[in-house]
């Protein structure tokens, strides 16, 4: 009778085991072990027992002890069970960003591991078990579907294998995959709202605002604002589930024409974009041209108003005839025209919007000098010893210099308060002089003496 010890062994893969083959007869003709495993016999006294060291056990095996005794041949098998933890425990790769409301399929693949009867695959969210299944197939695959929720944001999903050898007197061996961190997001189907000027003048600045509500997590949203090829650098303000990106846009003559303004919001692996056109225009203020800004009285003056070729102008409120970018008027300069404003108003339609510009010029009319009865009376009669202010106003542009002299030497104090004396009496020659010429006027002062009774 042949026996083997131990009859059952569980050992780690690549491990070694001592197997004892025994026989019940004292003088067996043969006693040995049959196995494909590398073996080494340990020398022992006696003929009816042999010990073998079996090494590098890679898979389950059933070495067989045999003996040949006088009463016949017999065999006994030992059962070697190899255990090893899986070589690969992996979650199938997934995009880290997943939209809320999507059904997400988690797939765990397990390669290797034995004994399979003791191997279980567990899918987890954090520490919460989602699914537990025995490992079947090579590679073993376990799947589960998760409906992505907002509160799953940042959750770690993992896959764990459990090789439970506790019933065999060993421990529970666990292997865990690298975690998959889920980033959940909500990007609404509505495109971002873009508020910007429809038209923008060259060498000016405009403000562009792009905003969107209903985002999650809003802090992860990327905003790209651009005008044509010019990337704008917005200041982004975040709300609970909204953002507002504000940027200044400067345009130059090179940008003139219709440009595309874009606002793109990227969140997770999705994006929403809004496009708008902005018309960049150049519109210098209209030109008011006077033949001469300063003319003498009686001179013919042409006032011209010129604007952008597509503009429509009015000159002093009168539309150009025909309607267009030029208007003019002719006038003979009079003193009343001195300081007169000529205003040219231009309207330019840019992409349906009306832009208004204005320019004003003043005409200077040189005239005079003038001395007339109204402003310089020819006769004054004043009581002696009274307080009087001689008044004589000369008119003209430029303002004339005025002197009133009696006998060429004695001045009349114009505009000053004086006590009337006999010396003041007489005829004065008032002379008004400017670059435009000279006029004279005689002014007589009569002094009334008081009557003594």
């Amino acid at each position: 009778q042949t026996s083997v010890s131990p009859s059952k062994v569980i050992l780690p893969r690549g491990g070694s085991v001592l197997v004892t083959c025994s026989t019940s007869c004292d003088q067996p003709k043969l006693l040995g072990i049959e196995t494909p495993l590398p073996k080494k016999e340990l020398l022992l006294p006696g003929n009816n027992r042999k010990v073998y060291e079996l090494s590098n056990v890679q898979e389950d095996s059933q070495p067989m002890c045999y003996s040949n005794c006088p009463d016949g041949q017999s065999t006994a098998k030992t059962f070697l069970t190899v255990y090893w933890t899986p070589e690969r425990v992996e979650l199938a790769p997934l995009p880290s960003w997943q939209p809320v409301g999507k059904n997400l399929t988690l797939r765990c693949q397990v390669e290797g591991g034995a004994p399979r009867a003791n191997l279980t695959v567990v899918l987890l969210r954090g520490e919460k078990e989602l699914k537990r299944e025995p490992a079947v197939g090579e590679p073993a695959e376990v799947t589960t579907t998760v409906l992505v929720r907002r509160d799953h944001h940042g959750a770690n999903f993992s896959c764990r294998t459990e090789l439970d050898l506790r019933p065999q007197g060993l421990e529970l061996f666990e292997n865990t995959s690298a975690p998959y961190q889920l980033q959940t997001f909500v990007l609404p189907a509505t495109p971002p709202q873009l508020v910007s000027p429809r038209v923008l003048e060259v060498d000016t600045q405009g403000t562009v605002v792009c905003s969107l509500d209903g985002l999650f997590p809003v802090s992860e949203a990327q905003v790209h604002l651009a005008l044509g090829d010019q990337r704008l650098n917005p200041t982004v303000t975040y709300g609970n589930d909204s953002f507002s990106a504000k940027a200044s846009v400067s345009v130059t003559a090179e940008d003139e024409g219709t440009q595309r303004l874009t606002c793109a919001v990227i969140l997770g692996n999705q994006s929403q974009e809004t496009l708008q056109t902005v018309t960049i225009y150049s519109f210098p203020a209209p030109n008011v041209i006077l033949t001469k800004p300063e003319v003498s009285e009686g001179t013919e003056v042409t006032v011209k108003c010129e604007a952008h070729p597509r503009a429509k102008v009015t000159l002093n409120g009168v539309p150009a005839q025909p309607l267009g970018p030029r208007a003019q008027l002719l006038l003979k300069a009079t003193p009343e025209d001195n300081g007169r404003s000529f205003s040219c108003s231009a309207t330019l339609e840019v992409a349906g919007q009306l832009i208004h510009k204005n320019q004003t010029r003043e005409l200077r009319v040189l005239y005079g000098p003038r001395l007339d009865e109204r402003d310089c009376p020819g006769n004054w009669t004043w009581p002696e010893n009274s307080q009087q202010t001689p008044m004589c106003q000369a008119w003209g542009n430029p303002l004339p210099e005025l002197k009133c002299l009696k006998d060429g030497t004695f001045p009349l104090p114009i505009g000053e308060s004086v006590t009337v004396t006999r010396d003041l009496e007489g005829t004065y020659l008032c002379r008004a002089r400017s670059t435009q010429g000279e006029v004279t006027r005689k002014v007589t002062v009569n002094v009334l003496s008081p009557r003594y009774e």
Epitope: V199, K312, V313, N316, G317, E349, L354, H356
Partner: antibody, heavy 123, light 110 residues
């Protein structure tokens, strides 16, 4: 000075229709002209405008559905490219250009309207 | 875009009373605003232009005011002939996609 629309009639959906606006007493080379419509019992709805130089602008809902063109110095057309029952309305043509003598600026203002022409779209 | 919001949508007023209609622009339109009224079967008729200037032949009972974004039309001493739908219209822009008219206010005279 006057404005008058013509061409309104009963059409089947999808049949293109052209309305004409005829002006007298002024020239279209000096004015912008707008088309406005009004569905039965509804408010005024601006369709689009044509400038003195022939540039056109449209309301967002009207783009691609309507075409405004100048056919002479006294006529402007509105083409409804593929009418639907929703296009049933009275269509008005209005002079849409004014200037303010105090500032000297031009602005949009519908100061002169036609009596309107009725378009009925029905199968 | 220049959105024009008109309030109220409808108002009832007794003969001799006063009615106020408001029009709000989403962006400044300076004073480029006109008011119209329209009676059934007729084209609109301009009452006021440049926010406050009375169109020729229009009764001085109609008064327009405001600038920028807020505008008001006031009808005082209401007559039965004033029963109509009133519209505001911005004169600042006719860009693509623009809103030109307010939604309208129906004035019912009792």
């Amino acid at each position: 000075q006057s404005v008058e629309e013509s061409g309104g009639r009963l059409v089947t959906p999808g049949t293109p229709l052209t309305l004409t606006c005829t002006v007298s007493g002024f020239s279209l080379s000096d004015y912008y002209m707008s088309w406005v419509r009004q569905a039965p019992g509804k408010g005024l709805e601006w369709i689009g405008i044509i400038s003195d130089s022939g540039s056109t602008y449209y309301a967002s809902w009207a783009k691609g559905r309507f075409t405004i063109s100048k056919t002479s110095s006294t006529t402007v057309d509105l083409k409804i490219t593929s009418p639907t029952t929703e296009d049933t309305a009275t269509y008005f043509c209005a002079r849409d250009w004014s200037y303010d003598s105090s500032s000297g600026y031009y602005y949009y203002d519908m100061d002169l309207w036609g009596p309107g022409t009725l378009v009925t779209v029905s199968a | 875009a220049y959105d024009m919001t008109q309030t109220p949508a409808s108002v009832e007023v007794a003969v001799g009373g006063t009615v106020t209609i408001k029009c709000q622009a989403s962006q400044s339109i300076n004073s480029w605003l006109s008011w119209f009224h329209q009676k059934p079967g007729q084209p609109p008729k301009r009452l006021i232009y440049k926010a406050s200037t009375l169109a020729s032949g229009v009764s001085s009972r109609f008064k327009g005011s405001g600038s920028g974004t807020q505008f008001t039309l006031t009808i005082s001493g209401v007559e039965s002939a004033d029963a109509a739908t009133y519209y505001c219209q911005q004169g600042y822009s006719r860009s693509d996609g623009e809103h030109v008219f307010g939604g309208g206010t129906e004035v019912v005279v009792k």
